[in-house]
């Protein structure tokens, strides 16, 4: 901590300007009034202070606002934000999306830091839900943001926010996350017609149940293999050969290249070889003709 020393004569800062970059650390501490700094925070960013000088300015703000900075100061922190610890940020009450954008801009191009993660957490908790504008902003800065959230956190995303989600935002989501997002997408897009609906829902289908896939197979959607490979294995298994053929349309030929990978491999094992042969793709590994198929899971459920 910087020692308390009197400000030399004539050095008392009247405003935050470039002359301050020539001040030593102790002079900044002694000669810059914290209240002046708070009201002129927007100027700090334009001045090439050293990291050591920024430490002094932060210290002054900490003394002035021991309970946490007001939003009027937070919004203009600029590069001083990089000096904040998650503990500092937990004291803040950030409600303005403009403030959030300003601080995310400072960290742009870098991985999400603990400070940014804390800031986002505080902001979303303050809003009570992850609304569309917030989601738009966060995914613009961090495309993987949505998939970094736990299923519990994702439950606060209202269906209306799903319109802001782009396919690339879901690239790293696992099935548990898609289980939460898919029903929201299903609700959000339900007023669209068949082909438009499929375009929007496609990236969320890794969370779809069997019956929805069966229904989609009646809609001539022509699902691509990349989407099919991301479907839940247990949702694909009950589909018949005819249903998969309808679901994939012209892309059904791609099954051959994927026959050793899940969910195609497991699905093949559940189909009668006779039925697989009707596809004319040379898929092997189905149930031989004449064998009786017992669905043990159903037996268990019925007993």
């Amino acid at each position: 901590e910087v020692e308390k020393t009197a400000c030399p004569s004539g050095k008392k800062a009247r405003e935050i300007d470039e002359s301050l970059i020539f001040y030593k650390k102790w002079e900044l501490e002694a000669c810059v009034d914290a209240a002046l700094l708070a009201t002129q925070m927007d100027r700090v960013n334009a001045i090439p202070f050293t990291y050591e000088q920024l430490d002094v300015l932060k210290h002054k703000l900490d003394e002035l606002y021991p309970q946490g900075y007001p939003e009027s100061v937070i919004q203009h922190l600029g590069y001083l934000f990089l000096k904040m610890s998650p503990e500092d940020i937990r004291k803040w009450n950030v409600t303005s999306l403009e403030t959030l954008k300003a601080l995310l801009e400072v960290n742009k191009g870098h991985e999400m830091s603990p400070q940014v993660a804390t800031l986002i957490d505080r902001f979303v908790k303050g809003r009570g839900q992850l609304d569309k504008d917030t989601l738009d902003t966060l995914t613009a800065f961090y495309p993987g943001y949505l998939c970094s959230l736990s299923p519990e956190e994702l439950s606060s995303v209202p269906p209306s926010s799903i319109w802001a989600v782009r396919p690339q935002d879901l690239d790293t989501c696992d099935p548990r996350q898609l289980d939460v997002l898919y029903p929201k997408a299903r609700l959000a897009f339900q007023n669209m017609n068949g082909s438009e609906y499929f375009v929007k829902i496609q990236s969320f289908l890794g969370g779809a149940p069997t019956e929805d896939l069966k229904a989609l197979s009646q809609q001539n959607v022509s699902m691509d293999l990349a989407t099919f490979m991301k479907l839940r294995t247990d949702a694909v298994l009950p589909l018949t050969v005819a249903e998969v053929q309808k679901l994939l349309g012209p892309h059904v030929e791609g099954l051959k290249a994927e026959e050793r990978h899940r969910p195609v491999r497991d699905w093949i094992l559940r189909q009668r070889q006779d039925d697989l042969d009707t596809l004319g793709l040379g898929l092997q590994g189905g149930i031989p003709n004449g064998y009786l198929v017992l669905d043990l899971s159903m037996q268990e459920a019925l007993s």
Epitope: P238, A301, L302
Partner: antibody, heavy 122, light 107 residues
Framework: QVQLQESGPGLVKPSETLSLTCTVS????????WSWVRQPPGKGLEWIGY???????NSNPSLKSRVIISVDTSKNQFSLKLSSVTAADTAVYYC????????????????WGRGTLVTVSS | EIVMTQSPATLSVSPGERATLSCRAS??????LAWYQQKPGQAPRLLIY???TRATGIPARFSGSGSGTEFTLTISSLQSEDFAVYYC?????????FGQGTRLEIK
């Protein structure tokens, strides 16, 4: 043909936890979303929440803090726990299946259990 | 949440006549509306979804219309088995909400 059957105590004391189970027979629990809906005597219907077989849930905000919905795929069952009950929670509780094959989208119910009356009283 | 209001609370109609039940939403639900019939001691039964599409096995005398905030269930020629309580339900947004019901009784 798929059938639903609710089971659980018919009487629960105030401040205790109401626990009900819905058994799905004649079909797999994995294919649909499953909901709980309740109806106080002589009143209308209130949606409590749904569950997917993976365990993913969504509940009515008016009850969220007191509701836990869970699933046991090995038994083809899903359950409801409602904590800190009061007389206002006295109702017939139904389990229901969210519609499947009728449409790709739609959160309404094409199959219902017969319902079970739960009375909250000391 | 979206509040669904049904009217009238009770409707008295003679067998063979037409019954018209109304349901109003506090904000637009597009066509995301279902109608159910409930008889004493029974679970509700799905009649209509998508505001106007009859569910499997529902007789043609039941028809639904409307979109946005105003919806109607019409039973063209009442049969004795049609006297029951009817509920509308919106599924445009969560939480899913139901109307308070209209009791259809024999006049």
């Amino acid at each position: 043909q798929v059938q639903l059957q609710e089971s659980g105590p018919g009487l629960v004391k105030p401040s205790e936890t109401l626990s009900l189970t819905c058994t799905v027979s004649g079909g797999s629990i994995q294919n649909y979303y499953w909901s709980w809906v309740r109806q106080p005597p002589g009143k209308g219907l209130e949606w409590i929440g749904y569950i997917f077989y993976s365990g993913s849930t969504n509940s009515n905000p008016s009850l969220k803090s007191r509701v836990i919905i869970s699933v046991d795929t090995s038994k083809n069952q899903f359950s409801l726990k409602l904590s800190s009950v009061t007389a206002a929670d006295t109702a017939v509780y139904y389990c229901a299946r969210e519609v499947g094959r009728i449409a790709v989208a739609g959160w309404f119910f094409d199959l219902w259990g017969r319902g079970t009356l739960v009375t909250v009283s000391s | 949440e979206i509040v669904m209001t049904q009217s009238p609370a009770t409707l008295s109609v003679s067998p063979g006549e037409r019954a018209t039940l109304s349901c109003r939403a506090s904000q637009s639900v597009n066509s995301n509306l279902a109608w159910y019939q409930q008889k004493p001691g029974q679970a509700p039964r799905l009649l209509i979804y998508g505001a106007s599409t009859r569910a499997t096995g529902i007789p043609a005398r039941f028809s639904g219309s409307g979109s946005g905030t105003e919806f109607t269930l019409t039973i063209s020629s009442l049969q004795s088995e049609d006297f029951a309580v009817y509920y509308c339900q919106q599924y445009n947004n969560w939480p899913l909400t139901f109307g308070q019901g209209t009791r259809l009784e024999i006049k």
